[in-house]
């Protein structure tokens, strides 16, 4: 139930953390599974445990197997497992899967590789960075803390990353490296409901007559490119162009916006001249596409 | 405001099963460890089963293999299924919190405390 | 298991008056992280337990001053400055090192 698997190569270090919940004052125990014997905490030793961590400087082949560790907490102590295995190193470029993190997913607007398990280390900018075993080099590629960012993702871009980095312990160095495969996706849109932003439902609006006045009715469809989206006005539940007053016309063409990524319509209702009679018809803000059409209702008074 | 609500009890036939419920509000429910503890009338108070935030359950010898212990983050709720009840399980049940896996600072014991459930097993 | 015993078991105490509770463990509540795992509650007629004292010597939020715990190890003390009618109910002493056991209870009652 709390076991973690971890892993690494041979030489390299390898820091695992005690999959069970700790708080500084509480001491964690280590143990080798198998022979139930005690990990050392001196750090003269090249296995140690150090809280809830437990440190490989460097790791070997024959350090593979079940550790436990145990949080000395009031009331309960806490059990968990760390199965670590160590590899030999690949003489070839090829990763085994067996060596991969997790996958993590890219796109044009957001394309950061986290450096798998670097919080655990005791590590100093730069990291390297390889794709594919060769050295990323180039302006779209920037090391930024524990990540990395591509500039432009392209679908050439997925593949292997790894990143390199030096652990320091006591005026000790030893290199780390983690891989993991990164893939790019095609922003994905979709279309909802629309949602009317203004005006609100049953608003009241105040003009003053003989001026101008505009009403904006706006509206939101959904993620990228909508096939069927629209937004108008009608006056009294007829379109305006049918209404047959000159004053009172919507503004041609139709403003496209990109609200929180979400693509948006607004249309204005331009009133000149602002007459006694205006105040008694019903604006209605109309938003529709494939999903239906939604309505909002607006009304004019004079404003004091 | 911090507050447990207990629900559930109730009078139930010896061998029989009782499930109680606890509601919580007012606090981050998913980082803290939860207990029942019952108190048999007229007497002391005595602990019978415990989760802790990651999940792991802990139980006294006298309800172990009877009674378990449960919860739902989401739901906010701890739930404890008593099976095999027997006339030594006449109690209140109280549900109570527990320590605070977000604070490294102090633990407080058992520092909120439901109404309690009064459960009574009798044929 | 730690068991915990308390003396005496039941008090009667005039208004304005001392009282002291005494509640000792069958083992060390020291824990590893140098804490000291002892609480104190008091449960009122028809009430849940409320928490008074934890760690041994520090008052809960909102309990008034006249309430204090001392002690170490495995010999620990309630004690109440001057007791009020307020203050009548059953005061436990309980320990969480090792799972949770409490005490029999001291019965407290105004003369």
């Known amino acids: 139930k709390f076991s973690k698997q971890s892993w690494g190569l041979e030489n390299e270090a390898l820091i695992v953390r005690c999959p069970r919940q700790g708080k500084p004052s509480y001491t964690v125990d280590w143990y080798y599974s198998q022979t139930n014997k005690s990990i050392p905490t001196q750090e003269r030793n090249r296995v140690f445990a150090s809280g809830q961590l437990l440190k490989f400087l460097p790791a070997e082949v024959a350090d593979s197997g079940i550790y436990t560790c145990i949080v000395r907490s009031p009331t309960f102590n806490r059990t968990g497992y760390a199965n670590v295995t160590i590899y030999k190193k690949q003489s070839d470029c090829n990763v085994p899967d067996y060596l991969m993190y997790s996958t993590v997913s890219g796109s044009e607007k957001n394309s950061k590789i986290y450096c798998p398990t670097i919080d655990l280390y005791n590590w100093t900018a730069p990291l390297e960075w390889f794709k594919n075993c060769q050295a990323l080099q180039g302006s779209r590629y920037r090391a930024h803390k524990s990540f990395l960012v591509i500039d432009n993702v392209m679908t050439e871009d997925a593949g292997d990353y790894t990143c390199k980095f030096i652990h320091n312990e006591n005026g000790a160095n030893y290199s780390v490296t983690a891989t993991r495969s990164f893939t790019v996706k095609d922003e994905q849109g979709f279309s909802l409901f629309p949602v009317i932003g203004a005006p609100a439902q049953n608003e009241i609006k105040e003009v003053e007559i003989g001026k101008n006045a505009n009403l904006t009715c706006s509206a939101c469809f959904g993620k990228g490119t909508q096939f069927l989206a629209a937004v108008l006005w009608q006056l009294n539940g007829t379109k305006i162009t049918d209404f047959g007053e000159p004053r009172i016309q919507q503004e041609e063409g139709q403003n496209q916006s990109f609200s929180n990524g979400l693509a948006c319509l607004d249309m204005v209702l331009r009133i000149a001249d602002v007459k006694e009679e205006d105040l008694l018809l019903q604006y209605d803000c109309l938003a529709l596409n494939l999903h239906g059409l939604r309505r909002h209702t607006v009304r004019l008074s004079r404003k004091n | 405001e911090v507050q447990l609500v207990e629900s559930g009890g109730g009078l139930v036939q010896p061998g029989g099963s009782l499930r109680l419920s606890c509601a919580a509000s007012?606090?981050?429910?998913?980082?803290?460890?939860m207990h029942w503890v019952r108190q048999v009338p007229g007497k002391g108070l005595e602990w019978i089963s415990s989760?802790?935030?990651?999940?792991?359950?802990y139980y006294p010898g006298s309800v172990k293999g009877r009674f378990t212990i449960s919860r739902e983050n989401a739901r906010n709720s701890l739930y404890l299924q008593m099976n095999s009840l027997r006339a030594g399980d006449t109690a209140v049940y109280y549900c109570?919190?527990?320590?605070?896996?977000?604070?490294?600072?102090?633990?407080?014991?058992?520092?909120?405390w439901g109404q309690g459930t009064t459960v009574t097993v009798s044929s | 298991n730690i068991v915990m015993t308390q003396t005496p078991l039941s008090l009667s105490v005039t208004p304005g008056q001392p009282a002291s509770i005494s509640c000792k463990s069958s083992?060390?509540?020291?824990?590893?992280?140098?804490?000291?795992?002892l609480f104190w509650y008091l449960q009122k007629p028809g009430q849940p337990p409320q928490l008074l004292i934890y760690?041994?010597?520090n008052r809960f939020s909102g309990v008034p001053d006249r309430f204090s715990g001392s002690g170490s190890g495995t010999d620990f003390t309630l004690k109440i400055s001057r007791v009020e009618a307020e203050d009548v109910g059953v005061y436990s002493c309980?320990?969480?090192?090792?799972?949770?056991?409490f005490g029999p209870g001291t019965k407290v009652d105004i003369k």
């Open positions: 109570t919190r527990g320590e605070d896996w977000s604070d490294d600072d102090y633990y407080y014991g058992l520092d909120v």
């Open positions: 007012g606090f981050t429910f998913s980082t803290f460890d």
């Open positions: 760690g041994v010597s």
């Open positions: 989760i802790d935030t990651e999940g792991d359950t």
């Open positions: 309980m320990q969480s090192l090792q799972l949770f056991t």
């Open positions: 083992q060390s509540l020291l824990h590893s992280d140098g804490k000291t795992y």
